[in-house]
């Protein structure tokens, strides 16, 4: 029943990925001439939720006062105006972290590294895990997904780097996760911070993926190179 | 056919709490929101409050919230409606009804309603 | 909260008579109107939602109408099974309200 009405803008606060217990807020924002808005789940088969809109009317919140793992999902909302309903919001993926226990997150050789040189970061999980993601704090598009071919359980993920530059500099945490749901993360790792030293000058690895031309050293996504890692996980980008 | 099949009567005290079960059979129960109308004795329909079965996501009229709960168990299709520190002004039928969710949002299917008393 | 005020509040007509009733509500509904009926010691009926649509199994001399805040119900050629009160309910938003009830009598 979708019509020509524009869709609705979809966000979280404080965010989309949130630590089990926690709270947070789903937002739809629409127009001034809502009458209603509808959040819908995906695979939930009646509107996962409906409410009045806000004053003044161009948008609704909807309220999960504590973060389990039935509400990690994918959610979409629309809203109805006089002529008809919306069509539907961007995609919202809400992630939940403390589904599992906290892998750890080791730099091989060291985080001391020299530009140019070779890093290899190292995320391990006591459980066997498909999924190991890397996280580099204050980046723009921070997720790198290593996931395991044909559901193989592992232990551990590489995530190797070479050449090392300034730009791969900064904190790491890592989350392992099994792919029947990629919304259910285990504890964040204890923070790795990987020091790189020499010049910063060093060229800027180039992205496999194309990037908004404003974006600067922090806005790239993660770039480890070289030969995917000998564990049986593949590499994707997310 | 779809069926909504309530809990028999109750008689209550003033102050103390009901709870009211509304069986649903004939169509997938997650599937609808559940609405709770009462209706006291000769008066018209007063709408409680709804609950999204596959989540327990509610809404309340503000004048129940404080008092009413809404609760599903999905094992067995049913829907409850808690409603405490009664008063005689609550002396009503209670009525579940099932949610249509299209143009209109209707409420297609009803109970047979169950009453309650509040005497002291 | 969106007042329904229907009207008449009672009304007498004989078997065969066209009858319509009226709902009114204090802010525009946007068509999200429904209609249902009550028979002493049972639990209402749809009868029409969105206005005008017919639910499942409901006689086609039922018939609605309306927009914005005013809205009827019709009932063509009035059958005995047909006494009975009749309310309106809005859908529009949260909480959804009903008309106070149109007691339709046998003359």
């Known amino acids: 029943q979708a019509g020509p009405l524009p869709k609705p803008t979809l966000w979280a606060e404080p965010g989309s990925v949130i630590s089990w217990g926690n709270s947070v807020t789903i937002w739809c924002q629409g127009t001034l001439e809502a009458r209603e808005y509808r959040l819908d789940k995906e695979e939930s088969p009646a509107p996962w939720d409906r409410q009045n809109p806000l004053e003044p009317k161009n948008k609704a919140r909807f309220s999960i006062p504590s973060m389990t793992e039935d509400y990690a999902g994918r959610y979409r909302c629309y809203y109805r105006s006089p002529v008809g309903w919306s069509q539907p919001s961007d995609p919202l993926e809400l992630v939940m972290t403390g589904a599992y226990s906290k892998p750890t997150l080791s730099a091989l050789p060291s985080p001391l590294v020299t530009s140019g040189k070779s890093v290899t970061l190292l995320c391990q999980s006591r459980s066997p895990m498909d999924t190991f993601l890397l996280i580099k704090e204050r980046a723009a598009h921070p997720l790198l997904h290593l996931r395991s071919e044909h559901g193989a359980q592992q232990h551990q993920a590489e995530f190797p780097m070479s050449p090392v530059t300034s730009v791969h500099g900064g904190t790491y945490r890592c989350f392992s996760s099994h792919g029947f749901s990629h919304y259910l993360l285990s504890h964040p790792s204890d923070p790795l911070e990987l020091i790189v030293s020499g010049s910063l000058e060093d060229p800027r690895p180039s992205p496999t993926r194309s990037v908004s031309t404003a974006a600067g050293p922090e806005d790239q996504p993660l770039m480890p190179t070289g030969s995917v890692p000998h564990s049986g996980l593949r590499r994707h980008w997310e | 056919q779809v069926q909504l099949v309530q809990s028999g009567a109750e008689v209550k005290k003033p102050g103390a709490s009901v709870k009211v079960s509304c069986k649903a059979s004939?169509?997938?129960?997650?599937?609808?929101?559940m609405h709770w109308v009462r209706q006291a004795p000769g008066q018209g329909l007063e709408w409680i409050g709804e609950?999204?079965?596959?989540?327990?996501?509610?809404n309340y009229n503000e004048k129940f919230k404080s008092r009413a709960t809404l609760t599903v168990d999905k094992s067995t299709s049913t829907a409850y409606m808690e409603l405490s520190s009664l008063r005689s002004e609550d002396t009503a039928v209670y009525y579940c009804?099932?949610?249509?969710?299209?143009?209109?949002?209707?409420?297609?299917?009803w109970g047979q309603g169950t009453t309650v008393t509040v005497s002291s | 909260d969106i007042q329904m005020t229907q009207s008449p509040s009672s009304l007498s007509a004989s078997v065969g008579d066209r009858v319509t009733i009226t709902c009114r509500a204090s802010?525009?509904?946007?068509?999200?109107l429904n209609w249902y009926q009550q028979k002493p010691g049972k639990a209402p009926k749809l009868l029409i939602y969105?206005?005008?649509r017919l639910h499942s199994g409901v006689p086609s001399r039922f018939s609605g109408s309306g927009s914005g805040t005013e809205y009827t119900l019709t009932i063509s050629s009035l059958q005995p099974d047909d006494f009975a009160t009749y309310y309106c309910?809005?859908?529009?938003?949260?909480?959804?309200?009903f008309g106070q009830g149109t007691r339709l009598e046998i003359k």
């Open positions: 609950i999204n079965p596959s989540n327990g996501r509610t």
């Open positions: 004939g169509y997938t129960f997650t599937s609808y929101w």
């Open positions: 802010q525009d509904i946007t068509n999200y």
């Open positions: 309910q809005q859908g529009d938003t949260l909480p959804r309200t």
């Open positions: 009804a099932r949610d249509r969710y299209d143009e209109g949002n209707a409420m297609d299917y």
């Open positions: 969105y206005t005008s």
